[in-house]
Interface confidence: low
């Protein structure tokens, strides 16, 4: 199709090379009443048609994206092409940064309902270029963590090094719906609740001489309980003593409840008492059993092929620890009588 | 649990100090909150304040109460007693119970504020 | 401000019957169900009975049920006990820019 009529917007992607980032490129189908590319040869301004098959971003889910070669090309249907490059709705993610996102993306409606529709389509021109900027040694990240229940805010990483005197206004997204309210370089949760997670993207428009174009980042905004206060706590095994059957295989289960903390190094594992011995036993890798908001539950077995009268002499403990501290579960065998 | 203290008879126009102590748990770990009730009446929500130890009101109680905290206590000034204040106070600990938010798990007793001339 | 309409303001039911109270919010609370039960008896402190619309509190009996989102809430009591009677409140959270809570104006349950 002939893309000359699409409208054009120019996005630019300063990526740092320090850390992982996303980057987003929304459908932005122009409203027909504000717009001359959809129906231009139908509607004037004031006028509204008897069906707006194409409403911008909100309603329009079922769009087509296109990359355009610079070497002149047909257009390539993204989803081919590009595995690094997903699309979901009328949103591209980028999964990975690099200068070679740097191109043409066009999107338009995959159903063409009427001849008026052909030029309702947009062209993105997205430059990619890596972070020179060294005199901002400490913007924000791409991805955000904001405590549930205290006050919080997310700052445009883009701009986390102005002040919000300096800062140009702001457009802000959240997961493609627009955040009209939020004009500066930081949103301020005065309480943040689970709902204020999500991805973020903050829009700022830069002019030289030349031409102006949209600076856009995109932040991932995580909302966390604060760093727990207590050591893990066993929640199996609950009985220090358990019945066997000699020959017989056998597996022990350790599950321990960990509180959330940041910076998460969880130890889970099993020793056996003998007499005067202790020693690890080489088991099976530990597993996260369920992870909510608040705490993880991992679980570590230890096999024994066959119970052996020397195992019922034996203290089979689990111990597991976090950063405040460690808890210990001991477990005796017993020969089932009968 | 949760106990309020300091209602007591005042005339109009006098400031009167509710303290609200815990025991069981770290009033600092929580955000704590105000509600009253004037006999036979509904509940009204007053404020709250944050386990960090700013506080939040309702609209028609900015500039007549004033909620604080120290390391063992929440406390709620009424700046200038009006007979409308006539009423029980009750002290409640909040709760975080995910996505949607807080609510008030743990009452005290109340204390009661009797305003007369 | 948010206002809470609980209706109706009294009602009285048989032991072993079914009680349902309403309470509509003047707008949605947080997240579309930040809204809470709670159960007064005279002299008392209220009791929080179910939080979240619908998640009974610890050791509140299953005859007690709540439903509804955003700004329509429903509390049904069934198997009606004399325990029950007092009255009852509903309870809302808003955005943290209006005022941050309301309740209801309260609905007393007398049971014969």
């Known amino acids: 199709f002939n893309i000359s009529g699409c409208s054009t917007k120019k996005l630019l992607w300063t990526y740092s090379t320090r850390s992982e980032e996303e980057f987003v490129l929304f459908c932005d189908l122009p409203e027909p009443q504000k717009s001359h590319f959809c129906h231009r040869n139908r509607l004037s301004p004031k006028q509204v048609p008897e069906h707006l098959p194409f409403m911008g971003s909100n309603d329009l889910s079922d769009v087509q994206w296109y990359q355009q070669p610079s070497n002149g090309d047909p257009l390539e249907d993204i989803r081919k092409s590009y595995p690094h490059i997903i699309q979901d709705k009328c949103t591209l993610h980028f999964l990975t940064p690099g200068v070679n996102n740097s191109g043409s993306y066009i999107c338009r409606p995959k159903m063409i309902k009427s001849p008026y529709d052909v030029a309702c389509c947009v062209k993105m021109i997205l430059e990619v270029k890596p972070q020179t900027n060294a005199s901002c040694e400490y913007s924000a990240s791409h991805k955000q963590d904001l405590l549930l229940g205290s006050t919080g805010s997310i700052s445009c990483p883009s701009l986390s090094c102005q002040s919000d005197a300096q800062s140009p206004a702001v457009t802000w997204y959240k997961n493609g719906k627009l955040l009209s309210v939020e004009r500066s370089n930081r949103i301020v949760v005065d309480e943040v609740y689970d709902y204020h997670q999500g991805t973020y993207v903050c829009d700022y428009t830069q002019s030289d001489t030349v031409s102006s174009w949209t600076v856009r980042a995109v932040v991932q905004v995580r909302t966390i309980v604060g760093d727990t206060k207590l050591k893990p706590d066993i929640l199996d095994p609950v009985e220090d003593t358990l019945e066997v059957e000699l020959g017989k295989p056998l597996t022990i289960s350790c599950k321990a409840r960990f509180g959330f903390e940041r910076v998460f190094n969880p130890v889970i594992k099993w020793y056996i008492k003998d007499s005067d011995l202790e020693w690890e036993v080489s088991v099976p890798e530990a597993k996260s059993i369920k992870s909510t908001l608040k705490d993880e539950i991992i679980e570590r077995n230890i096999i024994l092929e066959k119970v052996t009268q020397r195992d019922l002499r034996r203290k089979f403990v689990c111990f597991v620890q976090n950063s405040i501290g460690n808890t210990t579960q001991s477990v005796q065998l017993k020969e089932k009588r009968g | 649990s949760v106990e309020e203290s300091g209602g007591r008879l005042v005339t109009p126009g006098t400031p009167l100090t509710l303290t609200c102590t815990a025991s069981?748990?770290?009033?600092?770990?929580?955000?704590m909150t105000w509600v009253r009730q004037a006999p036979g009446k509904g509940l009204e929500w007053i404020g709250f304040?944050?386990?960090?130890?700013s506080a939040g009101y309702a609209s028609w109680a900015k500039g007549r109460f004033t909620i604080s905290k120290t390391s063992a206590t929440v406390d709620l000034r009424i700046t200038g007693a009006t007979t409308e204040d006539t009423g029980t106070y009750f002290c409640?600990?909040?709760?975080?119970?995910?996505?949607?938010?807080?609510?008030?798990?743990?009452w005290g007793p109340g204390t009661l504020v009797t305003v007369s001339s | 401000a948010a206002v809470l309409t609980q209706t109706p303001s009294s009602v009285s039911a048989a032991v072993g019957g079914t009680v349902t109270i309403n309470c509509q919010s003047s707008?949605?609370?947080?997240?579309?169900?930040?809204l809470a039960w709670y159960q007064q008896k005279p002299g008392q402190p209220p009791k929080l009975l179910i939080y979240?619309?619908?998640t009974l509190a610890s050791g509140v009996p299953s005859r007690f049920k709540g439903s509804g989102s955003g700004t329509q809430f429903t509390l049904i009591m069934s198997d009606l006990e004399c325990g029950d009677a007092a009255t009852y409140f509903c309870?809302?959270?808003?955005?943290?820019?209006?005022?941050?809570?309301?309740f209801g104006g309260g609905t007393e349950v007398v049971v014969k």
């Open positions: 069981g748990f770290d009033i600092n770990n929580y955000h």
């Open positions: 309870a809302g959270g808003y955005d943290r820019f209006i005022d941050t809570f309301a």
């Open positions: 707008q949605s609370v947080n997240n579309a169900k930040n």
């Open positions: 409640v600990r909040m709760f975080y119970a995910g996505d949607s938010g807080h609510y008030f798990d743990l």
């Open positions: 304040i944050k386990a960090g130890g």
């Open positions: 979240d619309a619908s």
